[in-house]
């Protein structure tokens, strides 16, 4: 019997201080350019080595963010979101949805923390 | 398997052009950043041309300006360079590199070397 895959949705307040090289992340999304099917949704694609973001440590690849300094992120096409992030600030305040994977064992196994998978 | 594939290039006289291209396969490119880079012979790799994923702004190194055109297809899944009025100093080697996503960083100097994941194995471009 194949196990089933879960998700466990977390939602964070993230505080970065724009770097040197900036914010230090790229982004996926929008109601032009779905990542991710039947979601309009900004999404992280890619964290900057040494950047603020990788310095700070918890904003991760796969991360949907929802707002930026209380400005909600739907129904924005692509490269608005881009501007926005771009002349957000030097103090920028996201809050994110994170989304572990979980592997669930088949029903009956005891195994939910099981982070395999 | 990720793969980017140049071609295009050869052997052209000063004042001629070229038209390179850089075909992706096993991804999508509608979601990636993508540019031109070329090394010359005992000389650093550099960025010479990039677009980001929407096709809605590009770079452009001060050396090319007014000559060289970069391009995106998504439904070809290709990207070009179009390369006018050749001179010398443009013999290099020409790659595509992608990135996914584009940056919420300023400055179009976005076409770093160090911003992109994924690289092809280039096109010798030869003017003489």
């Known amino acids: 019997m194949n196990g089933r895959v879960d998700y466990l949705v977390t939602e964070e307040e993230i505080n970065l201080t724009r770097g040197p090289s900036g914010l230090g992340f790229n982004i996926v999304g929008g109601t032009d350019q779905q990542y991710v099917s039947n979601d309009s949704g900004i999404y992280v694609s890619r964290i900057k080595e040494n950047g603020a973001a990788a310095l700070d440590g918890r904003l991760q690849e796969g991360d949907k963010i929802l707002s930026v300094n209380g400005q909600d992120l739907k129904n924005l096409l692509h490269q608005d979101a881009v501007d926005l992030f771009r002349n957000a600030g030097y103090a920028v305040s996201l809050r994110v949805q994170h989304r572990l994977q979980v592997q669930n064992g088949p029903i009956g196994h005891r195994g939910e923390g099981d982070p395999s998978g | 398997e990720v793969q980017l594939v140049e071609s295009g290039g050869g052997l052209v006289q000063a004042g001629g052009s070229l038209r390179l291209s850089c075909a992706a396969s096993g991804f999508t490119l509608d979601y990636y950043g993508i540019g031109w880079f070329r090394q010359a012979p005992g000389k650093e790799r550099e960025g010479v041309s990039c677009i980001d994923s929407s096709g809605g702004s590009t770079f452009y190194a001060d050396s090319v300006k007014g000559r060289f055109t970069i391009s995106r297809d998504n439904a070809k899944n290709t990207l070009y360079l179009q390369m006018n009025s050749l001179k010398p100093e443009d013999t290099a080697v020409y790659y595509c590199?992608?990135?996914?996503?584009?940056?919420?960083?300023?400055?179009?100097?976005?076409?770093?070397?160090?911003?992109?994941?994924?690289w092809g194995q280039g096109t010798q471009v030869t003017v003489s």
């Open positions: 590199a992608a990135v996914l996503g584009d940056s919420v960083d300023y400055g179009m100097g976005y076409c770093n070397l160090d911003e992109y994941d994924y």
